[in-house]
């Protein structure tokens, strides 16, 4: 029965006398008067079985002690660690000349585990063991025992097992512990390849080449190899494995990506958080699923956010010129998170009496620069029929628009060809003038020629002579122009817009801002 003692991971113990409970029962020759098994107490007051001999008075001592058979377990080289205490011959009275301070270590290889006698001539000498000059002080009970540790190695071994023997030649000695072990390179994982327990080679300089196997959920990148050195250390790792898609390296293992993370390829990268607007509900995701209403285009990388179709374009303006229409619009408020936005134009020709009866315009209509895939926010449509109602739809599209089952990304305008733009505004008045502002008001055009959508006020400093002007748009028939300079002459023009386009600007209204805080009320067309 052996108790557990902790040794380095690269050592495999074949015999440990300290772990044996009860008598060791090794064979001594002679049976009496030579080596004797003695129990002593260690520092924890636990008995240790030791062998001692102290035949220091008689010359020519030849006392042998042999271990039980020791299996070699496939090891080709074994190590023998002997802890012993040796008494100074000087401390023993009257023994000069007969007392020695060394002993000899032997081994004998055998396939027979039950050899009963010691045949000295079968044994091969390993070494003569002497106490080092430096002893280790070890508490044994209340005493300080001088413990010496010596390690020797033997190899190559070839038989199933072997015996060790200790020859005393007249020393006063106690073998406190005998441990026999071999060295292995312990099971390890390097570069995601597992290398098995590997017994070291026969020579102290030999290297054993070992091929590793990729850990679970990984694959070879380059063939993983390492070398097991004679001291039980792994050397020179070559090659490696990579975690499969959906897995990342954690603590030397390939573990599944956590929920909310993914990994698309077999690389040495870690799992990445799902891109915006996507999720994973299982561990080990190789890609993330787009949120409802979000999509991933065919050529989008798994690392890209999920995106959605754009919202409708804004501020669609039409300008009809006989049988041509110019359309202009603003980019959608929401591009869906994509840069590949473009615009498609749909033209429908509608009946005058019933606008719901519309049909495609056909191939006779021409679009500049093009009808579909527009990158700009304007288009010119020509070759329309005169005096006809047309509905134009501007569709904003991007790389994922085709996946959207409920498209609502268009804005439309209905125009009638040849419809006149509004007439100019006849009367513009400055209702209130201060140092920094002018309040304007005006009448609707005499001929609106349709629904007035908005008014545009253009103004500039008189001496700039229209080189630098500003525009203000409003749906009302009045506006406050603010942020003006005091004592400065400004010129104002106003024009109206219908669905058909802008009318002409009004005649200029010249107004000079005040120098004093008091307000000046004017109602003429040219207040100064």
């Amino acid at each position: 029965v052996t108790g557990s003692r902790v040794y380095p991971a690269n050592e495999v113990t074949l015999l440990d006398s300290r772990s044996v409970q009860g008598e060791l029962g090794w064979i001594a020759s002679p049976l009496e008067g030579g080596w004797e098994e003695v129990s002593i107490m260690d520092e924890k007051n636990t008995p240790i079985r030791t062998y001692q001999v102290c035949n220091v008075m008689e010359p020519s001592q030849n006392n042998w002690l042999r271990t039980d058979w020791i299996t070699r377990e496939g090891a080709q080289r074994v190590y023998i660690e002997i802890k012993f205490t040796l008494r100074d011959c000087n401390s023993l009275p009257g023994v000069m000349g007969t007392c020695k301070e060394t002993f000899n270590l032997y081994y004998y290889e055998s396939d027979n585990d039950k050899e009963r006698f010691i045949r000295e001539n079968q044994f091969v000498k390993i070494d003569t063991i002497a106490a080092d000059e430096s002893f280790t002080q070890v508490d044994i009970g209340d005493r300080i025992m001088k413990l010496n540790t010596e390690i020797r190695d033997v190899g190559p071994l070839s038989k199933k097992g072997f015996y060790l023997a200790f020859q005393d030649v007249g020393a006063c000695i106690a073998l406190v512990s005998v441990r026999v072990f071999y060295k292995k390179c312990p099971l390890t994982v390097r570069n995601l390849a597992q290398f098995p327990d590997t017994i070291t080679g026969a020579d102290t300089s030999s290297l054993v080449e070992v091929r590793g196997s990729c850990v679970n959920n990984s694959e070879e990148k380059d063939v993983p190899k390492m070398y097991c050195g004679a001291d039980g250390e792994w050397l020179v790792p070559i090659g490696n494995c990579l975690c499969n898609a959906g897995h990342e390296e954690r603590s030397g293992e390939c573990q599944a990506c956590k929920i909310g993370y993914y990994k698309a390829l077999s690389t040495d990268a870690t799992c990445a958080k799902c891109p915006p607007h996507s999720y994973s509900v299982w561990e080990g995701a190789t890609s993330c699923t787009c949120d409802r209403g979000f999509f991933r285009a065919d050529n989008d990388a798994a690392s890209m956010p999920c995106t959605r179709p754009p919202s409708a374009p804004l501020n669609l303006i039409s300008n009809v010129n006989e049988t041509s229409v110019n359309l202009e619009w603003s980019s959608p408020q929401n591009t869906g998170g994509r840069q590949d936005i473009s615009y498609n134009v749909v033209c429908k020709k509608c009946g005058a009496g019933d606008p719901s009866k519309c049909r495609p315009c056909g191939s006779g209509v021409h679009y500049t620069p093009q009808q579909n895939g527009l990158k700009t926010t304007k288009v010119s449509i020509t070759d329309l029929l005169a005096h006809t109602n047309y509905t134009f739809e501007i569709w904003a599209v991007n790389g994922v628009s085709k996946y959207n089952p409920n498209p609502d990304q268009s804005v439309s305008v209905t125009v009638t060809t040849n419809q006149a733009a509004p007439s100019s505004i006849a009367l513009v008045q400055a209702k209130e003038v201060t140092r920094y502002s002018v309040a304007l008001a005006w009448l609707e055009p005499d001929r609106p020629n349709g629904v007035i959508l908005e008014y545009e006020v253009k103004y500039y400093e008189k001496d700039q002579n229209e080189r630098s002007y500003r525009i203000v748009r409003t749906a009302a028939r009045n506006t406050d122009i603010k942020g003006l300079n005091p004592l400065t002459s400004y010129v104002f023009h106003v024009r109206a817009r219908t669905a058909a386009g802008y009318g002409d600007f009004s005649e200029p209204l010249e107004v000079t801002t005040n120098t004093v805080p008091s307000r000046i009320i004017g109602d003429g067309a040219n207040s100064t």
Epitope: G33, V38, I40, Q52, M57, E58, R87, G94, G141, I173
Partner: antibody, heavy 121, light 106 residues
């Protein structure tokens, strides 16, 4: 088994001599030193000295030089204690004891049964 | 020469009790200190050597400790056959015994 056999009691007159034998058996006589110990009636143990059975070299304790002699006959595995010019205060039990040297320490591990020497006129 | 002083001179204990005997040296004797037991009319018997090692055949109720100048012999549970005189001894240049401690029945 290992044993030391001593002779029976001796009664001597003052001034006489006595030779107490100690015969060893069960082990190699010359491999262990032999020690001599005196115990006066009702008293404690008193170490007299020892003899190296291999070389025959004796060592005497203080107070046991001159009249006390340790000797050997290795051919019969016997150690001897000879006391000359006996005095009344030499009356005691005399023990031979085998000396055991060990790496852990020393001790007298095997004792003879003792020989009572009585010195009386 | 080194003087060994044992205490107490007499120790009265009942069977089953613990007995602790002391031996003090006038100067350090390292750990080379044996203990002996002597019963009336018998030769002494080696109980402990090297301050704490028991020879074969000595019951494990006998234990000893100490080094330098202070040593102790302990009988964990005194048996009827343990009533005797106990001596310590030192192995200096000259070997000497303590005067002995008598363990008697209480």
């Amino acid at each position: 088994q290992v044993q030391l056999l001593q002779s029976g009691a001796e009664v001597k007159k003052p001034g006489a001599s006595v030779k107490v034998p100690c015969k060893a058996s069960g082990y190699t006589f010359t491999s262990r030193a032999m020690s001599w110990v005196r115990q006066a009636p009702g008293q404690g143990l008193e170490w007299m000295g020892w003899i190296n059975t291999n070389t025959g070299n004796p060592t005497y304790a203080q107070g046991f030089t001159g009249r006390f002699v340790f000797s050997l006959d290795t051919s019969v595995s016997t150690a001897y204690l000879q006391i000359s010019s006996l005095k009344a205060e030499d009356t005691a039990v005399y023990y031979c004891a085998r000396v055991r040297f060990t790496v852990y320490g020393d001790g007298m591990d095997v004792w003879g049964q003792g020989t009572l020497v009585t010195v009386s006129s | 020469e080194i003087v060994l002083t044992q205490s107490p001179a007499t120790l009265s204990v009942s069977p089953g009790e613990r007995a602790t005997l002391s031996c003090r040296a006038s100067q350090s004797v390292s750990s080379n200190l044996p203990w002996y037991q002597q019963k009336p009319g018998q030769a002494p018997r080696l109980l402990i050597y090297g301050a704490s090692t028991r020879p074969t055949g000595i019951p494990d109720r006998f234990s000893a400790s100490g080094s330098g100048t202070d040593f102790t012999l302990t009988i964990s549970r005194v048996e009827p056959e343990d009533f005797a005189v106990y001596y310590c001894q030192q192995y200096g240049p000259s070997w000497t015994f303590g005067q002995g401690t008598k363990v008697e029945i209480k």
